[in-house]
């Protein structure tokens, strides 16, 4: 069976098994203060 790894969001292949979101958000940062 074929391994499913981190694939692009426009691919038909699922990204779930890679453990990574298909288009991860950039982590929000709080301003120092």
């Amino acid at each position: 069976s074929e391994t499913t790894t981190g694939t692009s969001s426009n691919s038909s292949q699922s990204t779930s098994n890679s453990g990574l979101a298909p288009n991860p958000t950039n982590a929000t940062t709080k301003a120092a203060g």
Partner: antibody
Framework: EVKLEESGGGLVQPGGSMKLSCVAS????????MNWVRQSPERGLDWVAQ??????????RYVESVKGRFTISRDDSKNSVYLQMNNLRAEDTGIYYC??????WSQGTTLTVSS | DVVVTQTPLTLSVTIGQTASISCKSS???????????LNWLFQRPGQSPKRLIY???NLDSGVPDRFTGSGSGTDFTLKISRVEAEDLGVYYC?????????FGGGTKLEIK
């Protein structure tokens, strides 16, 4: 069977360069994002870089600490991913792994940056 | 960056007992597709990490069902029931929802 086999690594002086390579087999490489992760006693596990697919125009992402110094690239015809590291610093020392995501990991290769 | 905090740092258990490891993130790991990209890895000394669990609770192939992942949002747990000698090593959680992906500091499981 999925295999990720690395080459490269070793001892390099601060300010120097090193290129790591990783050859993949056992899965459809052209459909897979590829990543480099490093590990050190001081910082633990640290995601370094990611490269996406041809259909994504080989988009890349880097952790802030390596931006402008490291370049991830891939050659789909060779099922290979590379990490070119320039202007190396002592804090870049560690074991470098190539990974498909969180699921498959190479054996790791050690980079030591020291004078 | 999303801060991932694991506790305890070291866990000393008797063979046959249950071990529990906590992983907390500074931001929710729930992605817009309804999935939560929280993974658990295991590493023995001198070896590369091996994934045990993905999407909070899904066991990888070959991982015994003694391992259970649970949680949601920012709070996650790995439970190892009936601990065996082969379970000793370091366990890491890693989030794949936000870039840069970030790891917990690890929990070393020791056998009493």
């Amino acid at each position: 069977e999925v295999k990720l086999e690395e080459s490269g690594g070793g001892l390099v002086q601060p300010g120097g360069s090193m290129k790591l390579s990783c050859v993949a087999s056992g899965f459809t490489f052209t459909n897979s994002w590829m990543n480099w992760v490093r590990q050190s006693p001081e910082r633990g596990l640290d995601w370094v870089a990611q490269i996406q697919l041809k259909s994504d125009n080989y988009a890349t992402r880097y952790v802030e600490s390596v931006k402008g110094r490291f370049t991830i690239s891939r050659d789909d015809s060779k099922n290979s991913v590379y990490l070119q590291m320039n202007n190396l610093r002592a804090e870049d020392t560690g074991i470098y792994y190539c990974t498909t995501g969180t699921d498959y990991w190479s054996q790791g290769t050690t980079l030591t940056v020291s004078s | 960056d999303v801060v991932v905090t694991q506790t305890p740092l070291t866990l000393s258990v008797t063979i046959g007992q249950t071990a529990s490891i906590s992983c907390k993130s500074s931001q929710s790991l729930l992605f817009s597709n309804g999935k939560t990209y929280l993974n658990w890895l295991f590493q023995r000394p001198g070896q590369s990490p091996k994934r045990l669990i993905y999407l909070v609770s899904n066991l990888d192939s070959g991982v015994p069902d003694r391992f259970t992942g649970s949680g949601s949002g920012t709070d996650f747990t790995l439970k190892i029931s009936r601990v065996e000698a082969e379970d000793l090593g370091v366990y890491y959680c890693v989030q794949g929802t936000h870039f840069p992906y970030t790891f917990g500091g690890g929990t070393k499981l020791e056998i009493k």
